[in-house]
């Protein structure tokens, strides 16, 4: 359940998350499976360990195996698993198979390619993007934060799309390519100002104090695929994560097309052991897209 | 309401097997870590086995090799497997609530079922 | 493993007077995230032991507040401001850093 492929190309950096998350203060060790030895964590090392991080600076064919990595959580250690695979470059173009990250798909509304794991590295932009291993050029193409978008896309815009980047590590710099195919789809997609399904406005919600409640935030964008379009929850006008309340979390917006290809998007807040003062809370569930801004607000009462 | 109901207990000869379950509701069941902790005749609080939300299991000494935890989460449903049962197992066996082992969150053993009697005689 | 030792054994008590529960394990129960994972629960005669306290100081759900856990590392204590009749039973320490062990109970009876 908690193991993870990874993979990379020798001589550039790679950097692998352990797949049994924890919180950020929890300790983290990691070990090569087959031998039982610990990784160190002092920089000066080729590969070593850093919290949750595994890191191949830069990495050679021979690190390819199974990493452990043992989270120190409370009351358990748990496990993960990370099976790494180093390949050689590549003397061609072809980029085969087993390097290629998920396939995603654009519209000529929405032609975002995000580059793959970027998030592990400390780059620092713009990132250089290929396709096909030639590189992008004219004004159609914006390299923008960690992604490529592209105006007008058009079906012969498909292919595989390669991103590149510089990891800095204590002042040395490592390459990085990530590469992951684009298809176009043909469809007559439209974006509005978002419409909220759930909850409904001042709605208010009966809660037992001390047991469990989710609560949804659920809205609508437009038809097809969308640039933006993002649900969250506040609390009191605060976004959740400045909210430092550990039962209070809310989980990824899970994105939703109907029958009718409608584009929404669910937000899930979960409060646990529900108390009193959660009671005071004012629960905003926020929709936004390049239209705009729409709010519902929700109250939880005690149930009677 | 959140709630834990054990059932499987009985009289057992030394050497028997037993198989005990424990039920939940009111809850997201396959997010927390869940236990079972036993009460001999007179006696204290003593943990038995846990599970946590991958599955990975967890025993101390006096148990491994003949205790089995085991977790059913579309049924909502903890185990224990015992075989091997000797004596100093007679207990009433709790099934409890641990951690929410997906947010890392711990409030405590939060829930205890009302336990079962398990009990190894000849 | 560690291991829990409470005191004392047995409290015999006045309602509406103040008790003391002591409870000391064998190694710190403070984790890296910064909280003692140190709870605290009642077993009343003849039923499930129920949480009072966790992570050393947090009142349970419910719990009233006459409950009151403090102590860090090693040392912890259960405060109950004014004893009630309802508060008889057996309280247990327990720790939660690595797996669970429980103290060997302490009883609170009615003098």
């Known amino acids: 359940k908690f193991s993870k492929q990874s993979w990379g190309l020798e001589n550039e950096a790679l950097i692998v998350r352990c797949p049994r998350q924890g919180k950020s203060s929890y300790i983290v060790d990691w070990y090569y499976s087959q031998t039982n030895k610990s990784i160190p964590t002092q920089e000066r090392n080729r590969v070593f360990a850093s919290g949750q991080l595994l890191k191949f600076l830069p990495a050679e064919v021979a690190d390819s195996g199974i990493y452990t990595c043992i989270v120190r959580s409370p009351t358990f250690n748990r496990t993960g698993y990370a099976n790494v695979t180093i390949y050689k470059k590549q003397p061609d173009c072809n980029v085969p198979d087993y390097l290629m990250y998920s396939t995603v798909s654009g519209s000529e509304k929405n032609s975002k390619i995000y580059c793959p794991t970027i998030d592990l590295y400390n780059w620092t932009a713009p990132l250089e993007w290929f396709k096909n291993c030639q590189a992008l050029q004219g004004s159609r193409y914006k390299a923008h934060k960690s992604f490529l978008v592209i105006d007008n896309v058009m079906t012969d815009d498909a292919g595989d799309y390669t991103c590149k980047f510089i990891h800095n590590e204590n002042g040395a710099n490592y390459s990085v390519t990530a590469t992951r195919s684009f298809t176009v789809k043909d469809e007559q997609g439209f974006s509005r100002f978002p419409v909220i399904r759930a909850p409904a406005h001042n709605e208010t919600k009966e809660v037992e104090i001390g047991e469990n409640t989710n609560l949804t935030c659920s809205a609508c964008f437009g038809k097809g695929a969308q640039f933006l379009a993002t649900v969250q929850w506040q609390l009191n006008g605060n976004k959740i994560t400045d909210f430092s309340e550990p039962r209070i979390q809310q989980e990824e917006g899970q994105n939703q097309s109907f029958s009718n290809g409608l584009a929404c998007v669910n937000t899930v807040l979960r409060i646990a052991d529900v108390k009193e003062e959660d009671l005071l809370l004012r629960y905003d569930c926020l929709a936004l897209n390049l239209h705009g801004l729409r709010r519902h607000t929700i109250r939880l009462s005690r149930k009677n | 309401e959140v709630q834990l109901v054990e059932s499987g207990g009985g009289l057992v000869q030394p050497g028997g097997s037993l198989r005990l379950s424990c039920a939940a509701s009111?809850?997201?069941?396959?997010?927390?870590?869940m236990h079972w902790i036993r009460q001999a005749p007179g006696k204290n609080l003593e943990w038995v086995s846990a599970?946590?939300?991958?599955?990975?299991?967890y025993y101390p000494g006096s148990v491994k090799g003949r205790f089995t935890i085991s977790r059913e989460d579309a049924k909502n449903s903890l185990y224990l497997q015992m075989n091997s049962l000797r004596a100093g197992d007679t207990a009433v066996y709790y099934c409890?609530?641990?951690?929410?082992?997906?947010?890392?969150?711990?409030?405590?053993?939060?829930?205890w079922g009302q336990g079962t009697t398990v009990t190894v005689s000849s | 493993d560690i291991v829990m030792t409470q005191s004392p054994l047995s409290l015999p008590v006045t309602p509406g007077e103040p008790a003391s529960i002591s409870c000391r394990s064998s190694?710190?129960?403070?984790?890296?995230?910064?909280?003692?994972?140190l709870d605290w629960y009642l077993q009343k005669p003849g039923q499930s032991p129920q949480l009072l306290i966790y992570?050393?100081?947090n009142r349970a759900s419910g719990v009233p507040d006459r409950f009151t856990g403090s102590g860090s590392g090693t040392d912890f204590t259960l405060k109950i401001s004014r004893v009630e009749a309802e508060d008889v039973g057996v309280y247990y320490c327990?720790?939660?850093?690595?797996?669970?062990?429980f103290g060997g109970g302490t009883k609170v009876e009615i003098k």
């Open positions: 190694q710190s129960l403070l984790h890296s995230d910064g909280y003692h994972y």
């Open positions: 409890a609530r641990g951690g929410d082992g997906y947010n890392y969150d711990y409030y405590g053993i939060d829930v």
């Open positions: 009111g809850f997201t069941f396959s997010t927390y870590d």
């Open positions: 327990m720790q939660a850093l690595q797996i669970l062990t």
């Open positions: 599970i946590d939300l991958a599955g990975d299991t």
């Open positions: 992570l050393g100081s």
